[in-house]
Amino acid sequence: EAHKSEIAHRFKDLGEQHFKGLVLIAFSQYLQKCPYEEHIKLVQEVTDFAKTCVADENAENCDKSIHTLFGDKLCAIPKLRDNYGELADCCAKQEPERNECFLQHKDDNPNLPPFQRPEAEAMCTSFQENPTSFLGHYLHEVARRHPYFYAPELLYYAEKYNEVLTQCCTESDKAACLTPKLDAVKEKALVAAVRQRMKCSSMQRFGERAFKAWAVARMSQRFPNAEFAEITKLATDVTKINKECCHGDLLECADDRAELAKYMCENQATISSKLQACCDKPVLQKSQCLAEIEHDNIPADLPSIAADFVEDKEVCKNYAEAKDVFLGTFLYEYSRRHPDYSVSLLLRLAKKYEATLEKCCAEGDPPACYGTVLAEFQPLVEEPKNLVKTNCELYEKLGEYGFQNAVLVRYTQKAPQVSTPTLVEAARNLGRVGTKCCTLPEAQRLPCVEDYLSAILNRLCVLHEKTPVSEKVTKCCSGSLVERRPCFSALTVDETYVPKEFKAETFTFHSDICTLPDKEKQIKKQTALAELVKHKPKATEDQLKTVMGDFAQFVDKCCKAADKDNCFATEGPNLVARSKEALA
């Protein structure tokens, strides 16, 4: 239904706390360089204005769209051009072009320092002094670094953050309590960020239909007892919600997400038997719980998929007359039978089925042509299964850090033109798939591995798109979203690459490496490894192992030395010389 004042409507629906959080996220995602203080001032102005509209929907400007109101606020910021350059040009445009322009200027890799967690004591002090401000800073810092983070989910993580601090700041050993708990929240939030970026990429590049297909597959796996009409309704709603969030309509997105949770909880009987525990929770937790819900049990009496999609005489007629419904039904039926497949794989199978019908239906004997289509799925299913098997075996053998290094070597060979920081980030994230997925039961491994890898590779594509350097990466990234992972897996050593000259300074280290946290130390070593591969793309595994082992020993030795600086200065050149020799 239409409301006189959209901003009043959203304020009333969401409540002041969530309203303010979402407005802060929106501003932080649009203007990523502005300090917290500047954004919070705007948030307060918008909130005060919303309250006047709640009091009187006919008040001046209350009838304006939220994009218009937010855009006007952003465009009124002094020195916008000085800080944001051409983003200021957006302000010359009218809505909806202005908002589109803001979206195009979102930076997936903003030049911001990594978010440093303060010491436990300092954190607790500032949290206890002003919890609202503390959590506001959290929303701001995460949102500006992740401009596509799913806003209602970020509110949930802020709530989690709040819970952890409330609990741990009363403990005697605050750090021991905080560190593992906040690490867990951070890990979940980072995965959520790449997953949502992939959803927005899907929406931006391939439109709503592609996203809806993803949603149908996912919902069908989770709710195999729900009817197709129910799954379609849920998928349509989820598509709308994600479109809104990806498009910067965060208030509408959060409001609609809460509505969907309400709908699901009111219709548990026709959706899933697993929802009840979620439905007793408050709104943010309820939505999050529903988004992470375990799969319902598959109905016992499902007939063979072949009956309706191969043996039925009307297959071609049904396909030609309503592809969306017929192929949607195929995707639903196949997905509800296969919670053990990744969504990417299910979409590839649906695409293969569609392509087969498109090829066969006009022929003289269509059933003879498409009759073996289900058997032709086998190689498509085997490929990711083998990927999971070989990678999990490698992970079990090497551990997370060793596995990351193996992935780093592989990807540097595939795309040596890509910047070393991007390769290291991608390899570290890809390498985490082992810890995340390989320990799961067999039936959960494939969906976990492939859908996670797809999201990480999407991040690589997004970064590469900004400054394209590798034709191979461009080719994999510009194809269909579901084909990306197989495309990257199939890449081999780039034979066109001219090896980088050996620069001693790239492999020169100083005593500062000794005081770095383990993670930073690993990154330094992995940076050196990528540079080695760029210098010698065809180096054997043994050669790289020798050099990296030598390097680790060198760092270890010098960090234990009495005169660290002297050790690095004298031993460093020897290491460089030995490395050059080992790789010759």
Partner: antibody, heavy 119, light 110 residues
Framework: EVQLLESGGGLVQPGGSLRLSCAVS????????INWVRQAPGKGLEWIGI?????TTFYATWAKGRFTISRDSTTVYLQMNSLRAEDTAVYYC???????????????WGQGTLVTVSS | DIVMTQSPSSVSASVGDRVTITCQSS???????LSWYQQKPGKAPKLLIY???KLTSGVPSRFKGSGSGTDFTLTISSLQPEDFATYYC???????????FGGGTKVEIK
């Protein structure tokens, strides 16, 4: 050489009927889909319908009921009933690119036959 | 209702010019089922591009198709004398019965 050749056009009175033929040579018709497309004088192209190799037919929403497509081993037909002045057009038959069934990719066309509906 | 809007309806250009024709579809076409045809007076149309961007065999590389979903473009990078003609886009949808052509764009000599 592959050829599609339409015939059967001419002057017909409003309310009348006409059957157009599309003779296909140089290919085995039993493996291809054939479409009918029309073009009113000075106007754009308008898809009428398709017949698959199996004989299954589909029509544009506006064409259902008045137009019927059929085929034999070498010829595809378009039966047009209850003709109106606005049906005046050049009628083409065209082959769908092999490997496609429902896509609007027509690689071989006849030269067209003019149908004039007038009293 | 399916609407396929081609623009401009006509364009005057000279040999060597770059010409761009757009085709907007509502709703979006199915699976990039979008084709471009060239038609000269008194002749049947000729398929230039299918699947939005694939060139039919024998079609010169100065013809380029791009786009996806609802917005598509045909670009002729350097117009040749034989390119003066009318161009049509054709779209396929969820239902084959909705197969539609755009209104056409006439490329004339300036």
């Amino acid at each position: 050489e592959v050829q599609l050749l339409e015939s059967g056009g001419g002057l017909v009175q409003p309310g009348g009927s006409l059957r157009l033929s599309c003779a296909v040579s140089g290919i085995d018709l039993s493996n291809y889909a054939i479409n009918w497309v029309r073009q009113a004088p000075g106007k754009g192209l308008e898809w009428i319908g398709i017949i698959w190799a199996s004989g299954t037919t589909f029509y544009a929403t506006w064409a259902k009921g008045r137009f019927t497509i059929s085929r034999d081993s070498t010829t595809v037909y378009l039966q047009m009933n209850s003709l109106r002045a606005e049906d005046t057009a050049v009628y083409y038959c065209a082959r769908t690119v092999p490997g496609y069934s429902t896509a609007p990719y027509f690689d071989l066309w006849g030269q067209g036959t003019l149908v004039t509906v007038s009293s | 209702d399916i609407v396929m809007t081609q623009s401009p309806s006509s364009v005057s250009a000279s040999v060597g010019d770059r010409v761009t024709i757009t085709c907007q579809s509502s709703p979006s076409v199915w699976s990039n089922f979008l084709s471009w045809y060239q038609q000269k007076p008194g002749k049947a149309p000729k398929l230039l591009i299918y699947e939005a961007s694939k060139l039919t065999s024998g079609v010169p590389s100065r013809f380029k198709g791009s786009g996806s979903g609802t917005d598509f473009t045909l670009t002729i990078s350097s117009l040749q004398p034989e390119d003066f003609a009318t161009y049509y886009c054709g779209g396929g949808y969820s239902s084959i019965s909705d197969t539609t052509f755009g209104g056409g764009t006439k490329v004339e000599i300036k």
